[in-house]
């Protein structure tokens, strides 16, 4: 049995992969902040998790997704206040009993030291010193992600 | 209702720098960008650039060289400051709101003379 | 850069009668997240300029709906449905596609 979150973010990833492929992106847009080979954007307003996850999704983009420590902890350095919280793309999985990226793998445990609990609708937030698990109810600022097409040595056949 | 009010010394001298502060009120500068945009007596808009809430800038090319924009929350100020000016720096500098491509609110303006 | 040219240079107008603005870029303003940020500006002599327009298309709030925009791509439109005495002045369009640019400014004037 998914959760509604949990069907929301399967329909945004599958509407997402439905769209026309469009060319890859090799600086970030104006308005976006390069963070290695990222470009983000971090809201201005506020939203529950889900209209976060679909806003980054018209935006064509999706929710923050962070590989490991040293991607939280870059993603944190950019933060300056420390009262702002950001929803990322991580969210509790009540029928596997797990979180759970919109991409669809599971949270290492080793990645993210997570404060509070792990249940249903539960949603995950940064901050700049600390990762939260919030209700996905709760309307606070997120961050869309981009990721920057790596710029490759392309060998052309004669045409 | 958000107001935003230009101050800085409205004369400076050829090779010195331009240092002006935008005070913000009726909001916080802990949203959205916050934009320098500038207008030489009697002709059109030239962006300067703009500061991020999170801290982060982005100037215009043309003058990315000479162009710091860095912003105090604890004031809700922001500051432009551009070094080297010449004559063609001479403009009325406004401060605005950026919300992603809409300037949405101006200060009055202040008129800055590039003078010896 | 992204370049702007609108036009005409300057509308003299009849009040109650219509007026339009065209602007012109140099290349799509179709933002990399879908959005085309092309906004009107209008600069009443001796005043800071004032959004109109944002989005093409939408009116900022306060702004009569006697103003309306149109377009896409690279060719947009600002129409003052009934011009009246107090829309005199400069109007800007401006991108922010790329770092933003604005038009050379069209002067609405009253015949």
């Known amino acids: 049995q998914k959760s509604s979150i949990e069907k929301c973010s399967v329909d945004i990833q599958q509407s997402r992969n439905k769209t026309t492929e469009r060319p890859g992106l090799l600086n970030c847009p104006i308005y976006w902040q390069q963070l290695r080979e990222k470009c983000l954007l971090f809201s201005h307003t506020v939203n529950p998790w889900n209209n976060s996850l679909a806003d980054c999704s018209t935006k064509e983009s999706s929710l923050l997704l962070i590989r490991d420590k040293d991607e939280l902890i870059h993603t944190q350095n950019l933060i300056r206040d420390k009262a702002i919280l950001f929803w990322i793309g991580l969210n509790f999985s009540l029928s596997e009993k797990n979180w759970k990226w919109i991409n669809g793998s599971f949270l290492n445990s080793n990645d993210l030291e997570i404060r509070g609990d792990a249940k249903e609708n539960s949603c995950i937030s940064i901050s700049q010193t600390s990762v939260y698990s919030e209700y996905c109810s709760t309307e606070i600022r997120w961050i869309c992600q981009k990721e920057l097409t790596p710029v490759r040595n392309k060998v052309y056949p004669d045409s | 209702q958000v107001q935003l009010q230009e101050s800085g010394p409205g004369l400076v001298k050829p090779s010195e720098t331009l240092s002006l502060t935008c005070t913000v009120s009726?909001?916080?500068?802990?949203?959205?960008?916050w934009s320098w945009i500038r207008q030489p007596p009697g002709k059109g808009l030239e962006w300067i650039g703009y500061?991020?809430?999170?801290?982060?800038?982005n100037y215009n090319p043309s003058l990315k060289s000479r162009v710091t924009i860095s912003g105090d929350t604890s004031k809700n100020q922001f500051s432009l400051k551009l070094t080297s000016v010449t004559a063609a720096d001479t403009a009325v500098y406004y401060c605005?709101?950026?919300?992603?491509?809409?300037?949405?609110?101006w200060g009055q303006g202040t008129l800055v003379t590039v003078s010896s | 850069d992204i370049v702007m040219t609108q036009t005409p240079l300057s509308s003299p107008v009849t009040l109650g009668q219509p007026a339009s603005i065209s602007c012109r870029s140099s290349?799509?303003?179709?933002?990399?997240?879908?959005?085309?940020?092309l906004s009107w500006l209008q600069q009443r002599p001796g005043q800071p300029p004032r959004l109109l327009i944002y989005?093409?298309?939408n009116r900022f709030s306060g702004v009569p709906d006697r103003f309306s925009g149109s377009g896409a791509g690279t060719d947009f439109t600002l129409i003052i449905s009934r011009v009246e005495a107090e829309d005199v002045g400069v109007y800007y369009c401006?991108?922010?596609?790329?770092?933003?640019?604005f038009g050379g400014g069209t002067k609405v004037e009253i015949k």
């Open positions: 009726g909001g916080s500068i802990s949203s959205y960008y």
């Open positions: 989005k093409i298309s």
């Open positions: 290349q799509s303003l179709v933002h990399s997240d879908g959005n085309t940020y």
């Open positions: 500061i991020y809430y999170i801290g982060s800038t």
């Open positions: 605005a709101r950026d919300r992603m491509g809409a300037l949405d609110y």
């Open positions: 401006m991108q922010a596609a790329q770092f933003p640019t």
